[in-house]
């Protein structure tokens, strides 16, 4: 796969990734009513990051937003700012990439500006990816506790016995969006992985096609094959070389090299 | 106007059975799920069954679970209410009602049929 | 089964008067979700099939004069008329709509002195 096909490739990935982790966060259904071996409620409860919902058996749906900062869960409140966190990166992490993109010509940027973009853009993927992640396992892992502390005790009181009153233990279990963040963090992570690998083939490194100083008769001046190729956008960074003593050699370009995807 | 007529009521020896048909105007029946409620004569109101709009959830009293089924057409606005196995304490005004938009509550009422169960 | 207990089993009073009926419930019908209490109070006329009055327990259906009104949370609930009037005698009842089965309380009936 050439380094354009994979950085391209990785960058909508990560968008993909990253859109869903915007989804995942606005979601409503993070975690919903356990319906199974359950008393049969004439609502269905359901609850996300922002606020909590129920939908009456109408179909009329109502939401109750968390009004408060303080009285809410510490663990919900880590759950917030991780897929926050992982959002903020992701928008730097978009913005850096779109410039790194090597099918994107922006003014005289060269392929190590571009290699170091790619692979700053690749490694917030990868930590926004990660923070989804962390984010939606966190959760579900408060699910699955309050999940069988509310099934050892599916009801608080004796329910008549004393005068005591029963009241109904909602359980809750995964929502859709737990899917959609794992999915979404996982393809953020993924599309990150790929800028990384991408950027390993734009940076200028010496195994790949040195260029050859052609030693032409009269005139002691290097020409590099394929430096002026303006899809590459080398000929503004090509310079001429002395060469030191007669014949084909090579020598390192500090400026620039072709790498083995530019001629695919 | 919302209007909700219920015919096939009349005496039945126990065991026998019945049908109930409830014939709705005056609003979008497929959008709206429908509940038939019974009162026994002199007694209090019965919840008897209830059929989500798209008949995706039906659920019904333990009283007559097992032995009453709810069904609806929607083509033809009609709800209905199988009676099978019925017995001398089935002996009710059977409403057919209307689930409300809002709050779970049963906002329109048909004005009922009876249905005697005695031999 | 939600049991839904009403109190008193019957009243009279005098016109103009104010009138408050209780219903309890054995289970809370309140729903953490959007706030609200699945209760519901009809009234019901002699001869007539009952009539929606009050939903999510303190909401009232349109069309139904302001002088009724309910209150209460969670298992204990009123229903409030400030100042009965001659058509207000009937049989009112409160309704857990909470739950399947969606039972009724036994009913609490009005009578005019």
């Known amino acids: 796969m050439s380094v354009t096909a994979c950085q391209g490739l990785g960058f909508v990935v990560s968008l993909i990734g990253f859109a869903g982790i915007i989804a995942a966060t606005c979601m409503d259904q993070w975690s919903t009513q356990d319906l199974y071996n359950n008393p049969v409620t004439a609502v269905f409860n359901y609850q996300g990051l922002w606020r909590s919902c129920v939908r009456e058996s109408s179909g009329f749906t109502e939401c109750r937003g968390y009004f408060t900062l303080l009285g809410l869960p510490a663990m919900l409140q880590a759950v917030r700012a991780l897929m926050i966190v992982g959002i903020v990166l992701g928008v730097i992490g978009i913005l850096v990439s779109i410039f790194a993109l090597k099918c994107i010509r922006i003014g005289s940027m060269d392929d190590s500006a571009k290699a170091k973009m790619t692979l700053t853009s690749g490694i917030l993927f990868i930590i926004s990816g990660i923070c989804a992640i962390i984010g939606v396992s966190v959760f579900a892992n408060m699910l699955v506790t309050n999940f069988w502390m509310s099934t050892a005790n599916m009801y608080s009181g004796m329910g008549g016995m004393g005068g005591m009153v029963q009241t109904v233990q909602t359980r809750y279990t995964f929502g859709a969006a737990l899917f959609v963040g794992w999915v979404a963090g996982g393809l953020t992570l993924i599309g990150g992985v790929m800028m990384c690998i991408a950027c390993r083939g734009l940076t200028p490194d010496d195994s790949n096609f040195k260029a050859v100083s052609y030693h032409a008769s009269g005139q002691n001046v290097a020409y590099r094959p394929g430096g002026f190729k303006a899809s590459t956008g080398f000929g503004s960074n090509t310079r001429n070389k002395k060469i030191y003593d007669g014949g084909a050699r090579t020598e390192d370009d500090e400026q620039s090299h072709p790498t083995k995807y530019d001629y695919v | 106007e919302v209007q909700l007529v219920e015919s096939g009521g009349g005496l039945v020896q126990p065991g026998g059975s019945l049908r109930l048909s409830c014939a709705v105007s005056g609003f979008t029946f497929s959008s709206f799920g429908m509940h038939w409620v019974r009162q026994a004569p002199g007694k209090g109101l019965e919840w008897v069954a209830y059929?989500?709009?798209?008949?995706?959830?039906?659920y019904y009293a333990d009283s007559v679970k097992g032995r009453f089924t709810v069904s609806r057409d929607n083509a033809k606005n009609s709800l209905y209410l199988q009676m099978n196995s019925l017995r001398a304490e089935d002996t009710a005004v059977y409403y057919c009602?209307?689930?409300?938009?809002?709050?779970?509550?049963?906002?329109?009422w048909g004005q009922g049929t009876l249905v005697t169960v005695s031999s | 089964d939600i049991v839904m207990t009403q109190s008193p089993d019957s009243l009279a009073v005098s016109l103009g008067e104010r009138v408050t009926m209780n219903c309890k419930s054995s289970?809370?019908?309140?729903?953490?979700?959007?706030?609200?209490?699945?209760l519901t109070w009809y009234q019901q006329k002699p001869g007539q099939p009952p009539k929606l009055l009050i939903y999510w327990a303190s909401t009232r259906e349109s069309g139904v004069p302001d002088r009724f009104s309910g209150s209460g949370s969670g298992t204990d609930f009123t229903l409030t008329i400030s100042s009965v009037q001659a058509e207000d005698v009937a049989v009112y009842y409160c309704q857990n709509v909470y739950i399947y089965p969606l039972t009724f309380g036994q009913g609490t009936k009005l009578e005019i002195k």
């Open positions: 289970q809370s019908l309140f729903s953490s979700g959007n706030q609200r209490n699945y």
């Open positions: 059929i989500s709009s798209g008949t995706t959830n039906i």
């Open positions: 009602v209307r689930s409300g938009y809002y709050g779970n509550s049963l906002d329109y």
